[in-house]
């Protein structure tokens, strides 16, 4: 009777089914949808999480201006194809044979096409801009306190290395968190900024992916930080390829 059997759960992913019958009596936690046995000591990839979600029952400005190439996830939920490592496949298709190319966070980066569409490589999203608006408070938050709290959150809750939180901007009531992670910077075992941003997004929406933890209770010097709007912009290492028709629409 091992410790794994006593506590066979997945702290970092509640969309799993766990059982204490892995090799050597270890706990194994399989993601819903894909069935892959995930690493419960770190974040699960966004692709496996989206797959699990689709399989589950339905329930003087200091601010950054997103570049013209920044993508916003306007397409919403879909059931993705994940590669052997649980990352997004470069080409995604739906049941009606409509296909499109995605970046490493699963956001569409081309016009939709048919089965002949080619997506040669999975393009990395190396810069994520999380744009938040907080609810009115008695006064503005202290910028350095806010900066420290958000950096702590990404380090402790999402296990993202501090070097990948590039900046925290604040101009009441808007907060912007910049995450940057080039392919060359990401070492084995590093949390991906796309996965961290997705966990944060779900936390902000009150849909935490963590097992048994309460929702996100963000406080700056004891003052609750309540978010009323979130926009996330994704910048890829190679700019997206959309037709002029879409860009002028």
């Amino acid at each position: 009777h091992t410790a794994a059997q006593d506590n066979c759960t997945c702290p970092t992913n509640k969309m799993t089914v766990c059982s204490p019958d892995g090799p050597g009596g270890r706990c194994q936690c399989r993601a819903l949808g894909s069935g892959m046995a995930v690493d419960c000591s770190t974040l699960t990839s966004k692709c496996l999480l989206l797959k699990a979600r689709m399989s589950a029952p339905k329930n003087a400005r200091t601010l950054v201006r997103p570049s013209e190439h920044a993508l916003v996830d306007n397409d919403g939920l879909y059931d993705p194809d994940c590669d052997p490592e649980g990352r997004f496949k470069a080409r995604q298709c739906n049941q009606t044979s409509v296909c499109w190319c995605v970046n490493s966070v699963g956001v569409r980066r081309t016009d939709k096409g048919d089965l002949s569409l080619r997506c040669d490589e999975l393009v990395r999203t190396h810069h994520i801009l999380i744009d938040l608006r907080h609810r009115p408070t008695a006064g503005a938050f202290n910028h350095s306190d806010l900066d420290a709290e958000l950096r702590r959150l990404f380090r402790e809750r999402y296990r993202l290395h501090p070097k990948f939180v590039a900046a925290v901007h604040y101009e009441q009531p808007t907060i912007q968190i910049e995450l940057r992670q080039n392919t060359s910077q990401k070492a084995a075992g590093d949390v991906d900024i796309g996965d961290a941003a997705y966990y944060f997004e779900r936390d902000i929406k009150g849909e935490s992916l963590f097992q048994g933890r309460g929702g996100l209770d963000l406080r700056v010097r004891g003052e609750p930080l309540q978010v009323e709007r979130t926009l996330i912009y994704y910048l890829d290492e190679i700019p997206p390829k959309f037709s002029m028709k879409r860009l002028t629409a």
Epitope: A3, G22, G24, C27, M36, A37, V38, D39, S41
Partner: nanobody, 120 residues
Framework: QVQLQESGGGLVQPGGSLRLSCAAS????????MSWVRQAPGKGPEWVSY???????YYPDTVKGRFTISRDNSKNTLYLQMNSLKPDDTAVYRC??????????????WGQGTQVTVSS
Amino acid sequence: QVQLQESGGGLVQPGGSLRLSCAASGFTFSGSDMSWVRQAPGKGPEWVSYITSGGTTYYPDTVKGRFTISRDNSKNTLYLQMNSLKPDDTAVYRCAKSRLTDSHYVEDAWGQGTQVTVSS
């Protein structure tokens, strides 16, 4: 990029044998633990054998004594010898790049799979 390609599946009669192979690339095979995972129709995946980089093996009771996992590091290939096959062994068999933590069994990558059907 990790690639795992299984082969050797097919139709076999109860009591028969099959040998599955898995060609691995895109990672240091010799330093990686590996496993075989199967998924029967309408059921969830289950591991059926595990081998560490050093050659230690694990089997669940359902296949112990019938299945043997082995590896050839010089060929970057994983094998599963299946003897005394039963209809219950019918499933898609996948190889997986795996590891054991202090408390958990983890699959970091897996292949597309090969179909094994045991029927008379």
